[in-house]
Amino acid sequence: EPTMYGEILSPNYPQAYPSEVEKSWDIEVPEGYGIHLYFTHLDIELSENCAYDSVQIISGDTEEGRLCGQRSSNNPHSPIVEEFQVPYNKLQVIFKSDFSNEERFTGFAAYYVATDINECTDFVDVPCSHFCNNFIGGYFCSCPPEYFLHDDMKNCGVNCSGDVFTALIGEIASPNYPKPYPENSRCEYQIRLEKGFQVVVTLRREDFDVEAADSAGNCLDSLVFVAGDRQFGPYCGHGFPGPLNIETKSNALDIIFQTDLTGQKKGWKLRYHGDPMPCPKEDTPNSVWEPAKAKYVFRDVVQITCLDGFEVVEGRVGATSFYSTCQSNGKWSNSKLKCQPVDCGIPESIENGKVEDPESTLFGSVIRYTCEEPYYYMENGGGGEYHCAGNGSWVNEVLGPELPKCVPVCGVPREPFEEKQRIIGGSDADIKNFPWQVFFDNPWAGGALINEYWVLTAAHVVEGNREPTMYVGSTSVQTSRLAKSKMLTPEHVFIHPGWKLLEVPEGRTNFDNDIALVRLKDPVKMGPTVSPICLPGTSSDYNLMDGDLGLISGWGRTEKRDRAVRLKAARLPVAPLRKCKEVKVEKPTADAEAYVFTPNMICAGGEKGMDSCKGDSGGAFAVQDPNDKTKFYAAGLVSWGPQCGTYGLYTRVKNYVDWIMKTMQENSTPRED
């Protein structure tokens, strides 16, 4: 507890002090007072530097004195032999004695009293910036006119802070400008403009004179500009040292002017204005900006349009352009959007063809569709090459975005038929020689595949069974072989309207218009054992002449068997119709004259006993295409005959091409792509 005065006596005083003693006293007087310590008696063993016994006076970390020996007062009117005056309110006194004393020493007697200190004069550092006023136990600071005392109660400054400037243009100057600015002041000015405008500060060099920096380069008085996390300055010296035009990139600016106690100059004056916040002219690849300007500012809107082949992808939606607005923060809206190369995606697959997995599906990439050769070819041309176009579609030069269509190659057997002299008079064949050959099991007959969905046959084959079961792809027709082949399911049978339906078909003598089409439920997959035969063209090139050779195939009656198990075939010449008329009907069901012969019939055979027979009906009479020797077309269909092993009659397919085409077109279902 602080006291105003007190007494300090060495141990046993006034008796001799003991050896090996160390005692300390902590003196404390109230705040605002100093301590006057004085000794009235001093009798301590004398030694050099008071090394043996001593009384030590310590103020804080400073030793104020160390006493030993004997002292007596110099003033007969005062008992004080030694005294100390400290301007602090704390003091420590330490007494020490060593292990022996040569004589008897009585120690010391000391007193302390609290004394007033003059804070205004007693210290090197003046406590007040301006006026200091001392009183007993303390002091107070005061300020000249127009100055106020800061919260620290020591420093005076001018009231130059708190101004907020919101106008888009203005002028700010230091206090008293151009007269000297106040010392020891911190002036803060705030400029707060509407968002989207940046504060631009302009100064003239001659409008700036602030106390120069010290030898270390530190400004004693300084002007600082703070805009968000950016700082300009500190600036000081004669003439403005910074840029005369400061673009702050911010709508808020704090101006801080700090002065010290010395060296007042005229100060500074500045102008400011609000510029619409500029947005950088960004280099956005693969795009063009509209409108194009040298500089873009707050509220400017640009349309960024991607170059051809590039698109903006936002979520799942692709667009070719987007709008961007220069925002109040100096940044563009939609800045994350970029023009990326258009991605055409994985190309669609096509029926009976393929497309290699592309290395890239981006703009400019190229893919190639191919058909499953040699069984399919590209019907709609274009070469199959597609490139990824700017609109995100795979595009072909000829077809545009339309996909190629792979259609069956017609009339090309995988293995050519080699005629063997052994059908009647014919020889064994392989289905690869006649991949268009269709087997009907009820009645036992034939047909010709003409495309993926259609089978051509004789009307008399299907007139009694409108839901025939058909097979393709097998040389042999045992049940086990057929089970391993492809069964075709009919959707509808179309018999030529000119075919006369009879109640008793067995007695038929008129086979005119003996032609029918079977529409299949599902498309047939082509391959080495299954592929269509071509239809004849309509030109005169496809008019048959006597002696023209054609191939017939089927599982009909042979010399040895009622029905063949393995496919048989023969090569026959076309003969004049009269040759067929001249042959006597083997088992006539009517008068020979009743049998009808028309230009819709082809007569063929008569050589070496080669002929079609019962069970071959509906099969194709295949003739080499006059315009493409690699292909065969169905010139005829096995129809009827007077006698097996002689001449046979075949429906002349050329006369029905229009009907065939019309029937197929009217009954085609659009491909589900």
């Epitope: 293995e415 064994d428 392989d430 040389t475 042999s476 049940t479 063949a564 393995r566």
Partner: antibody, heavy 118, light 107 residues
Framework: QVQLVESGGGLVKPGGSLRLSCAAS????????MSWIRQAPGKGLEWVSY????????YYADSVKGRFTISRDNAKNSLYLQMNSLRAEDTAVYYC???????????WGQGTLVTVSS | DIQMTQSPSSLSASVGDRVTITCQAS??????LNWYQQKPGKAPKLLIY???NLETGVPSRFSGSGSGTDFTFTISSLQPEDIATYYC?????????FGGGTKVEIK
């Protein structure tokens, strides 16, 4: 007249190989499907393999599949049977036969004996 | 695979006797069946094709019948030269399987 003559038979150790040949004459060889049929001593007939006229289609009995290969050379009027990884149970007289048409064998060779024994 | 069961495996008959051999298929083979004759030390010879058709040059005492799974081969009047082993063979499916054979002897 039609003649089929087999050759290439003989004694071979298990695991060994042999190539049988069948020379055809008296008919147009390329007109006909051909087969190999074997008969183990004192046993019945066992069909081994079949080949189409062009040679593009071939069939094998399960017992020889993967070990035997049938082939033909129409230019040389010859039928062949390459036999690898032979086993004791392959011991038999091997006949080549002409498929007259529709799987009926109307002409056979005299046969060649293959003996597989160590 | 289709199994062909031939019976009897052997038989003894007198000259002039009617001899019947049966062949049973393990599944329906329609009429896809042939009959062969093999004399000792000789190659087989085709007698009947398609279950019932007599091969050219074969004596008419030989005949065949049946369809589906059950087939019969008949020698209407056994002759000394008919001593041989007879085999049926199916061709409905691969593998082409022969019956086990029937050995015919003269009493």
């Amino acid at each position: 007249q039609v003649q089929l003559v087999e050759s290439g038979g003989g004694l071979v150790k298990p695991g060994g190989s042999l190539r049988l040949s069948c020379a055809a004459s008296g008919f147009t060889f390329s007109d006909y499907y051909m087969s190999w049929i074997r008969q183990a001593p004192g046993k019945g007939l066992e069909w081994v393999s079949y080949i189409s006229r062009s040679g593009s289609t071939k069939y094998y009995a399960d017992s020889v599949k993967g070990r035997f290969t049938i082939s033909r050379d129409n230019a040389k009027n010859s039928l062949y049977l390459q036999m690898n990884s032979l086993r004791a149970e392959d011991t038999a007289v091997y006949y080549c036969a002409r498929d007259e048409t529709d799987y009926a064998y109307d002409n056979w060779g005299q046969g060649t004996l293959v003996t597989v024994s160590s | 695979d289709i199994q062909m069961t031939q019976s009897p495996s052997s038989l003894s008959a007198s000259v002039g006797d009617r001899v019947t051999i049966t062949c049973q298929a393990s599944q329906d083979i329609s009429n896809y069946l042939n009959w062969y004759q093999q004399k000792p030390g000789k190659a087989p010879k085709l007698l009947i094709y398609d279950a019932s058709n007599l091969e050219t040059g074969v004596p008419s005492r030989f005949s065949g019948s049946g369809s589906g799974t059950d087939f019969t081969f008949t020698i209407s009047s056994l002759q000394p030269e008919d001593i041989a082993t007879y085999y049926c063979q199916q061709y409905e499916d691969y593998p082409l399987v022969f019956g086990g054979g029937t050995k015919v002897e003269i009493k």
